[in-house]
Each structure stands twice: as C-alpha cells, then as structure tokens.
C-alpha cells in the first residue's frame, strides 16, 4: 500500500483491544481545504514504542487503515480510498508493546465535516439576572454551530455546560454565575447539525470573578503630624486576594478586584475640591486636617461593599507663631510663610462647638511679604470672630490647592475673639491679711483662660497711696492668686489685676482699696 | 487576644439617660482604637461612636449632641454616655477594638475585636 492511501488490507497486528486506561483519544476528523483533510488525536501513556494506525470503514462494510508511525495527525486527500462524501466510521488503534488499544468511534460525512474554531477575540462578559452572559463575534464563514461551555472554580473540577445552537453572526452563551468565588470559562464549537463532527479546541480561558467582591478587609494607621505639616496614611494590612481556578493565576484579565481609596477632607469645606479617589497602592500623605476615609472594592460587575473610617484633626503642629493685630479698621494675622504662590486657607470655630461647621476663607495665592510673613485681614463688619469667645484657628496651605492630597498644616492655634482685653478682665478680686506686712490677693480666672496658650500671664499692680508708688507682679497663667509683702501698716493701697496675652494687654480690674491695721502693743 | 465586656443596659425612657461600659483585658488598651456600634435585629451593625488612644473622638450624625464617649486608659474602660434617648436608640450596642493609631473605623469590619453586646431598650 501507498503511504498516501488508506491500505485496503488486513493491519500488521493482532485485532484485539487491551482496554487499558491508557491509549488513543479524542479523535476528530474534518475537511481543511476543498480537497484535504485532517485526522488528528490525543494518546496517552508512554510514547516510546507506540505505532498508530487510523482505521476507516466505509458504509459498504470494506476497511482500511492509514499507518502514521508515531504521529498522531494525518493529512489525507479525497484520493485517498475513503469516501468523503458519504458516512464513514474512524477510529484510531496504537500498537505498543504487544498489545492494541482503540480509540472511540466517530461516524461523519468528511466532505460537511469542516473544523470549526473556538470564539476567537474578545469575548464579553455581562451579568443578567443573576447569570453570566459571553458573547462574542463568530468566527469567519462558521454561522451554525453547536456550542459548549466548561468551567471550574479554585476548588473543583471541570463542569461541562451547553449553550445551545447558534445561528447568527454573534454568538453568546448563559452561564452558571458564582456568588463569592472565581471561574475560569473555556468555550468550544462544532457546526450545526452534524452530531459526529467533531468539536473545535478550547477557547482561551474566560476569567469572571464572584459576582459579589470581597470585602475590603483593610487596617490603617496614620502617622504623627510631621514638621512639614503632613502626616502619612499607612496600610497595615493588604485586602485579601481572591483565590483563581489554575487557568487564571497568570496575569488574567476580567477577574482582577480592584480597590480605591476615597478621600474626603472635611476640614477647610471653602475649598475647591473635597473628595479624591486614588489607587489603594497609593498611600497618600495628609494634612493635619479631618477626614473621612473608604475602601472601594469593585470588579467587572460593578462596585461592591466598601470599608469606612474617620481621621480625626491632629492640631499638634510645631509651635508656630500666629499674630493677630486688631485695629481700628479690622483685625490682621500674620504667621510665617510657605514658599511663593501659596494659597492659604484659614479655619475657625467657636471651642465646644466642634459638631458645627467650621468657618473657612481661602484666600488668594499669595507670596511672603519682605518679613517673610503670610497675611489675612478681616474687617470689623464681617463679624468674623467677633464674639468674645475662645475660637480654634486653623490654617492649611497648599501650591495646588485643587490637589487634596497636596494640603499640609502650617498651624494650629487658639484666639480669643471681640474685645479680648476687656473681655478677658479678671473679676471677683479680693485681697485678705496674710501676715502684719503682706495680704493675698486672689481673683477669679480671666475668661481668657479657657482658650489654650491664649492667657501668657496676670499683672498684679499695688499702688501706694501716699507716695503714688506703683509695684508691679507678674503671675503664671495657671495661678490666680499672688501674696504681697513689705507693705507698711496703716497706708492705703489700691489693688488692680490684669490678664495679658502674647499680643495684647489687658485691661486693668476695678482698683480694690485696702490697708494693714496698725497693731498697738500692749 | 483581646477580651471586650459591655454593662450597663437596659429599659429607659424616651428622653432618658444610660451609661454603657466596657471593660477590655488582654492586650495594650491605650494603643486600641475603640468603638460602640449598634444592630437592630434583621439590620447591619451601625457605626455609633469611636474613640483613638489619644481621645479624639467622632460620633455617627444620629447621635452628634447627644452620646458621648470617653475612655479611661489606667482602668482599661470606654464608656458610652447616652442622653436625651429616643425609641428609635433601642438596639444590642457592641463595644468593638482594633490596633491601630489615629484612625477610626465606621464600619464594623475595620474592627477586630467584639463584645456580646448589651441591649438598650427606649420606649416612648
């Protein structure tokens, strides 16, 4: 017999199957050109050693054989000996060893049995209701085909799935979707209404995540408040990773999570842009401000539950001086400023009132005066911290104001606002014999004492009456009561305290008068 | 492993007071952030209150004005201070902890560690 023929003859071995798990599979058989034709199979086992013959019986009952040697693909043309227009029966026996092992049976019309080819391209991947819809362009000249579907999930094995026939220039298929756990899809064709022929390969894997996407399961932390003004959002803990089918452990598309960082700084609300979303790798850096933070997790189906947390305001800046001057045409600030161009936001709000929303100004990009100095003015009429009350003072900068991330603290202070010098006059001033040349002297703290670092000291001032000599004693801001000695019995005295702060004198108390009775001896 | 104990709830009349506690062991308490959250059956945990390990605070909208939260680091103890109740407060109020600086979480998988839970009841 030719090599290129099927052998008309009696094979060169014994008939019988071993039936052994090992040995020819899969076998298909199509047309590849309009008069070639294609056998092709798998075998497994050992290799070494192993002839294959593929075998062919036509509907007249006569056989024959191709004999491939260690090939498992024949190439054959319709001058072959087998009929290709009408039914034939193939199948493959591999010699090895002394035995026989065969293949299963296909009976086909090799002329209509054409190979057809898996979805090829980009197969899209939706959701409906409650199930996973692919769809995808079929293939050139391969409208009609019988489509099937596997799929497996990290911990099972293949499933197989049909989608039913297809009869248009795009194919799609409804598929099993998962609630919490990745699949790998693979998908295979074979035409319309020709059970025997055979199926295409698979199609590349289809990844799909869960249709729910885990939760976050991030931690945080936030580092101190550095010296620039900014602290750093650190992640303590990565989101779990999701577990994939083998076929999709590679860099695979479609099942990837992603996560993103919402950020929404809730300090400063006068600014451009409050609300930032960034990448979760990218950690940002803050400023000392409040925020509101969350983790986005999302797939190809949409976004899915999402972690919250709240940054409460650092204030602990470096001490940094703010000056307040209050003229008759409004009041002024002064801190040191930040490079060229900077714009400044100035926050404040009444101390206790930390719910409410705070009062903000932007002001415009600005560059340090000769001393260096960045400003703000207000006037009288704004009423701008004009009650005489304790307020918080904040102030953030940034280059790029419209950049969330790009706001640091330059400081953090306290002001008492209106006419903090009369406001902040002590009252109750009461002064009591100490001995029989001093007298304690105690008042009841100066309003200005509520507001930290406001208070920078009390005056006590003695006036002697006969000679008009003033003495002058200052005391901590802590203390509220100072002893006054050497002080000669049965002279007037008049006693006034005030409470100062860094940039302001206060005014002075109502003058208490007081004497040291004489003693007589006996 | 940090263990979390509430006390103090009960039935209480719209308008009233209640002060829950909750008592931690097994772990550095000061560097724990602390929370209460609360959950009324067939609802998700809700964020209530949280505290750092340096005291600052923040409070869900509902309660802002009204609960307030304090911890007390030498004794291992957060409280929950809550006035002027109203009906729709009834619900198993968690004490929850999570190591963490500066940051609170608002929602309940950010944190690590629960109590059981002590139920407040308000009723009209």
């Known amino acids: 017999c030719r090599t290129s023929e099927c052998c008309f003859q009696d094979p060169p071995y014994s008939d019988a199957d071993s039936g052994s798990a090992s040995g020819p599979r899969d076998l298909s058989c199509y047309r590849i050109s309009s008069a070639g034709y294609e056998c092709s199979w798998q075998y497994e086992g050992p290799t070494a050693g192993v002839s294959h013959f593929l075998r062919c019986c036509l509907s007249s009952g006569r056989c024959c054989y191709f004999a491939t040697g260690s090939a498992t693909r024949l190439q054959f043309s319709d001058q072959a000996g087998v009929s290709v227009l009408h039914t034939v029966t193939l199948w493959v026996e591999s010699w090895a060893r002394n035995r026989t092992e065969k293949s299963p049976e296909v009976t086909l019309q090799l002329y209509k049995s054409v190979k057809y080819k898996p979805p090829l391209g980009d197969i899209k991947v939706s959701k409906l209701a409650g199930q996973l819809r692919m769809e995808w362009e079929t293939p050139d000249n391969q409208v009609g085909a019988e489509v099937q579907f596997r799929h497996r999930t990290p911990s099972s094995s293949w499933k197989l799935g049909d989608c039913g026939p297809q009869d248009d220039d795009t194919e799609s298929c409804l598929c099993p979707l998962e609630m919490n756990v990745a699949q790998e899809f693979q998908l295979r064709r074979r035409r319309l209404g020709s059970q025997g022929s055979s199926w295409s390969k698979w199609s590349s894997p289809v990844c799909v995540p869960p249709e729910n996407p885990p939760q976050p399961q991030v931690r945080f932390s936030v580092e101190q408040l550095g010296r620039d003004g900014r602290r750093r959002l650190t992640l303590k803990e990565q989101p779990t990773q999701l577990e994939l089918p083998e076929g999709c452990q590679g860099p695979a598309p479609g099942v990837e999570v992603t996560y993103q960082l919402q950020l929404h700084m809730l300090s400063c609300p006068c600014k451009a842009k409050a609300t930032r979303t960034l990448p979760l790798e990218k950690m940002p850096y803050l400023s000392g401000a409040a925020y509101n933070v969350a983790v986005i997790s999302s797939n190809r189906f949409g976004p899915g539950p999402n972690q919250t947390w709240h940054i409460p305001a650092d204030t602990h800046t470096e001490p940094v001086a703010l000056n307040i001057s209050v003229g008759t045409n409004g009041t002024t600030m002064y801190w040191p400023a930040r490079a060229q161009s900077t714009t400044y936001c100035i926050e404040w709000q009444p101390v206790g009132q930390e719910g409410s929303l705070a009062t903000c100004n932007l002001t415009a990009p600005q560059d340090p005066d000769p001393a260096g100095m960045a400003t703000y003015s207000w006037s009288r009429e704004s009423g701008a911290m004009g009650q005489e009350k304790c307020y918080h003072i904040t102030i953030f900068a940034s280059a790029h104001p419209k950049k969330l991330t790009l706001w640091s603290t330059v400081l953090s202070t306290y002001h008492f606002g209106g006419n903090a010098s009369a406001a902040g006059t002590p009252h109750h001033v009461s002064v009591k014999n100490h001995s029989l040349d001093s007298v304690s002297v105690d008042w009841a703290p100066s309003l200005l004492s509520t507001c930290p670092g406001v208070l920078k000291e009390y005056v006590v001032r003695c006036r002697d009456e006969d000679s008009n000599q003033v003495s002058e004693h200052p005391v901590q801001p802590t203390e509220t009561q100072v002893t006054l000695s050497d002080l000669r019995a049965g002279v007037a005295y008049t006693v006034q305290v005030r409470a100062d702060t860094a940039w302001l004198r206060g005014a002075w108390s109502q003058p208490q008068r007081f004497s040291i009775k004489v003693q007589v001896s006996d | 492993q940090v263990q979390l104990v509430e006390s103090g709830g009960g039935l209480v009349q719209a308008g009233g007071s209640l002060r829950l506690s909750c008592a931690a062991s097994g772990g550095p308490f000061s560097g724990y952030v602390m929370g209460w959250f609360r959950q009324v059956s067939g609802k998700e945990r809700e964020f209530v209150a949280g505290?750092?390990?340096?005291?600052?605070?923040y409070f869900a909208d509902s309660v802002k004005g009204r609960f307030t939260i304090s911890r007390d680091n030498a004794k291992n103890m957060v409280y929950l201070q809550m006035n002027s109740l109203k009906p729709e407060d009834t619900a198993v109020y968690y004490c929850?902890?999570?190591?963490?600086?500066?940051?609170?979480?608002?929602?309940?998988?950010?944190?690590?560690?629960w109590g059981k839970g002590t139920l407040v009841t308000v009723s009209s």
């Open positions: 505290i750092t390990g340096i005291s600052s605070t």
């Open positions: 929850a902890a999570v190591n963490s600086f500066g940051v609170i979480p608002t929602s309940p998988n950010g944190m690590d560690y």
